[in-house]
């Protein structure tokens, strides 16, 4: 874990990367994609308290405000920081091709 | 407005840029800010439902698999997609000096 | 994400020197404005110094000519040299990042 990674919520319920599976019925790609079959989506899942991966001077604005005004303003939001490319097998009309998806899996997450 | 701005919600209830205005007390600032006094605060705020202003594939996925397991898998987060420079006037030992933060105020909106 | 570790307090006597030492990590301290609170016994937390991004430095007429803030940005790192130390600058001494993320603190006493 990095410098600043301790979850004050508790093991595991803040800001992380989590990896749910998902088939190709279950994200709509049935009908264009024929492999992978089934995918691992990696997402960033988790609460954001004070200052936690705080991705920058907005995120932690945000936190302020957020004490101040908790019903007009939210709490940071977990969002992916970075992200890893994909390779599909797509279909075609002449056959199949390989498209590669730089912004589809989560590499890493932060707040804001 | 772009392509999937239509807030199925009602008009305003969506992911839109809001203003906050805030205090330099309020941002915890008031020790080394002498201008402005006050800041109007751009922020994202508002709901992300199915394809509204969807950052990338990764958003869309999201929606997807959120429908499907609402409980595992939160829907998409309204979050800056840009950012707007902001000059902030401090005492210095020599006088006063302008300095801009360049990711401090949210200047457009999207759902990731 | 956002963390600051001080360092380098300790027990001093009357007329003596310490440097300070604030590491941070989750984010690059170049863009922001740097600064040293401390807080006596009994008392408020209170700004002592700080640096903003463009270089120009603040301290309190109590320690000016006594204490200087710097900056190494390649480390990532903030200092504050103290010297000609008096029993009244007895305190835990704090690093802040102006945006609400503050350090543990670092004791500083000066007693002969």
């Known amino acids: 874990a990095r410098n600043g990674d301790h979850c004050p919520l508790g093991p595991g319920r803040c800001c992380r990367l989590h990896t749910v599976r998902a088939s190709l019925e279950d994200l709509g790609w049935a009908d264009w994609v024929l492999s992978p079959r089934e995918v691992q989506v990696t997402m960033c899942i988790g609460a954001c308290p004070s200052q936690f991966r705080a991705a920058n001077m907005h995120a932690q604005i945000k936190t302020s405000l957020h004490r101040l005004k908790p019903d007009t303003v939210p709490a940071p939001c977990c969002v992916p920081a970075s992200y890893n490319p994909m390779v599909l097998i797509q279909k075609t009309d002449t056959g199949v091709s390989l498209q590669t998806y730089d912004d589809l899996l989560a590499k890493d997450c932060h707040c804001i | 407005a772009r392509n999937g701005d239509h807030c199925p919600l009602g008009p305003g209830r969506c992911c839109r840029l809001h203003t906050v205005r805030a205090s330099l007390e309020d941002l915890g600032w008031a020790d080394w800010v002498l201008s402005p006094r006050e800041v109007q605060v751009t922020m994202c705020i508002g709901a992300c439902p199915s394809q509204f202003r969807a950052a990338n594939m990764h958003a869309q996925i999201k929606t997807s698999l959120h429908r499907l397991k609402p409980d595992t898998v939160p829907a998409p987060c309204c979050v800056p997609a840009s950012y707007n420079p902001m000059v902030l006037i401090q005492k210095t030992d020599t006088g006063v000096s302008l300095q801009t933060y360049d990711d401090l105020l949210a200047k457009d909106c999207h759902c990731i | 994400q956002v963390q600051l570790v001080e360092s380098g307090g300790g027990l001093v006597q009357p007329g003596g020197s310490l440097r300070l030492s604030c590491a941070a990590s989750?984010?690059?301290?170049?863009?922001?404005?740097m600064s040293w609170y401390r807080q006596a016994p009994g008392k408020e937390r209170a700004l002592v110094a700080y640096?903003?991004?463009?270089?120009?430095?603040y301290h309190i007429d109590s320690v000016k000519g006594r204490f200087t803030i710097s900056r190494n940005n390649a480390e990532n790192t903030v200092y504050l040299q103290m010297n000609s130390l008096k029993p009244e600058d007895t305190a835990v001494y704090y690093c802040?990042?102006?945006?609400?993320?503050w350090g543990q603190g670092t004791q500083v006493t000066v007693s002969s």
């Open positions: 802040g990042n102006g945006f609400g993320s």
């Open positions: 989750g984010f690059t301290i170049r863009t922001y404005t």
């Open positions: 640096i903003t991004p463009g270089g120009p430095t």
